[in-house]
């Protein structure tokens, strides 16, 4: 198209010059470049009411270059495309459009979401989490001893963070109450404050015990809640202390 226009212009204008500027092989005062030096691309630039031929080493933004036997021509990309390989494959869309499969869309198809950074339609990515870790040891204030109700925790990792429209991530840690393993705390695990608290609590429980003589030896459920387990432990402790008291008839002041 441009080459044939160039040929027509040459017939119309006898003042076709061979001493042209900026990569032109032939040119005219009125139309600028009519043909280009080897490997340069011909493009028509609109200046006011007229079109001027220009020869460039590469095509401007919004155009792509095609090499024909008679002309290397810059062709316009599609109207919504800023950079393209050819008419079928846009590589960068104009502002407000999203790139998808080489085409520019004003909104992304279902199942895809707009990435406003790359201006592309991308697959929706849902959160992916790993399996839960095993439950941690049952602990109370960082200790794994002392017949107390504690907590145990398990965690999981986020393997894939979600994209904007993806499903949110689930919690990454879970805590539940448990009974601390029944064992005495070694000296290193007991602090002064801890001993005083235990002494006060023990005296309180002994006072309670004198007014209550319940002996729970009935059938118990095979599955117990942490509360039930703790109550059972406390009752057993109270019975043991009552027997010891009767034997020694001395007030117990320390926990062994």
């Amino acid at each position: 198209q441009n080459a044939s226009r160039g040929r027509r212009q040459r017939r119309m204008h006898p003042n076709v010059s061979q001493g042209c500027q900026g990569g032109c092989a032939t040119c005219s005062d009125y139309n600028g470049c009519l043909s280009c030096k080897p490997r340069l691309f011909f493009v028509l630039e609109r200046i006011g009411m007229k079109q001027i031929g220009v020869c460039l080493s590469s095509c401007p933004s919004g155009y792509y270059g095609t090499r024909y036997p008679d002309i290397n021509k810059c062709t316009k990309c599609k109207v919504d495309c800023d950079t393209c390989f050819n008419k079928n494959f846009c590589t960068k869309c104009k502002s407000g459009f999203y790139l998808h499969l080489g085409k520019c869309l004003d909104s992304c198809p279902e199942g895809l979401e707009a990435n406003n950074h790359t201006m592309e339609c991308v697959s929706i990515v849902h959160c992916e989490a790993s399996e839960w870790s095993p439950w941690s040891p049952c602990m109370k204030k960082g200790k794994t001893c002392g017949f107390k109700r504690g907590t145990e925790t398990r965690v999981r990792d986020i393997l894939q963070h979600p994209s904007a429209k993806g499903n949110l991530c689930p919690p990454t840690s879970e805590t539940r109450t448990c009974i601390v393993q029944r064992k005495k705390c070694s000296k290193g695990e007991r602090g002064k404050k801890g001993r005083e608290r235990k002494r006060k609590k023990l005296n309180k429980e002994e006072r309670k015990e004198t007014s209550s003589s319940s002996d729970s030896k009935g059938l118990e459920s095979s599955i117990e809640t942490p509360d039930q387990q703790e109550n059972k432990e406390r009752q057993q402790q109270q019975k043991r202390r009552a027997r010891d008291k009767q034997q020694k008839s001395v007030s117990v002041s320390t926990v062994h």
Epitope: A3, Y64, R67, Y68, P69, F85, F89
Partner: antibody, heavy 116, light 107 residues
Framework: EVQLVESGGGLVQPGRSLKLSCAAS????????MAWVRQAPKKGLEWVAT????????YYRDSVKGRFTISRANAKSTLYLQMDSLRSEDTATYYC?????????WGQGVMVTVSS | DIQMTQSPASLSASLGETVTIECRAS??????LAWYQQKPGNSPQLLIY???SLIHGVPSRFSGSGSGTQFSLKINNLQSEDVASYFC?????????FGAGTKLELK
């Protein structure tokens, strides 16, 4: 969806003529340069001819110049290849394709056999 | 005309292997090179343009490289669906020319 459907192939004697057609749909036919590419049995691909989007310029490989004519009817979204003075070496599957530097979309092909 | 020399003409590889197909141009074609895949009984399909730009939907195990006159197509982790003939094509100059093709088979 882009579709290119070739027709008009067949068995023909050397020196005779054949006209291939390619019906296009799923894209703006008048925006695209179109080409014919052929493939001889068990051989490679060979570009035959190209016509630019508006039909104003045509290009041919040397071996078919003066014998083959590529044309188009944009109103009908149809591409043609008029093949005259056929030779045995023209035996091939002929594909019509969009030609925009690369051959992006291809038809299913039509077989042309030139034999006496 | 620019001659495109493709090698090997055929090759046999096992699933999971990496294969490389070479294409040499008789003169500098810059980065104006494409690769096509043609599965048995089908039309060719554009895989790669501008040496290394993958067409949308082409698996990332396909990659192209090179410049000037020496180019290659690499297929990592070969799959059964990759059994096909592969052709290079230059579009730097008319007539656009293709390599003779490489037929890829499974061992």
């Amino acid at each position: 969806e882009v579709q290119l459907v070739e027709s008009g192939g067949g068995l023909v004697q050397p020196g005779r003529s054949l006209k291939l057609s390619c019906a296009a749909s799923g894209f703006t036919f008048s925006d695209y340069d179109m080409a014919w590419v052929r493939q001889a049995p068990k051989k490679g691909l060979e570009w035959v001819a190209t016509i630019i989007y508006d039909g104003s310029r045509t290009y041919y490989r040397d071996s078919v110049k003066g014998r083959f004519t590529i044309s188009r009817a944009n109103a009908k979204s149809t591409l043609y290849l008029q093949m005259d003075s056929l030779r045995s070496e023209d035996t091939a599957t002929y594909y019509c394709a969009t030609h925009d530097k690369t051959f992006d979309y291809w038809g299913q092909g039509v077989m042309v056999t030139v034999s006496s | 005309d620019i001659q495109m020399t493709q090698s090997p003409a055929s090759l046999s590889a096992s699933l999971g292997e990496t294969v490389t197909i070479e294409c040499r141009a008789s003169e500098d074609i810059y980065s104006d090179l494409a690769w096509y895949q043609q599965k048995p009984g089908n039309s060719p399909q554009l895989l790669i343009y501008d040496v290394n730009s993958l067409i949308h939907g082409v698996p990332s195990r396909f990659s192209g490289s090179g410049s000037g006159t020496q180019f290659s197509l690499k297929i990592n982790n070969l799959q059964s669906e990759d059994v096909a003939s592969y052709f290079c094509q230059q579009y730097d100059n008319y007539p656009n020319t293709f390599g003779a093709g490489t037929k890829l088979e499974l061992k």
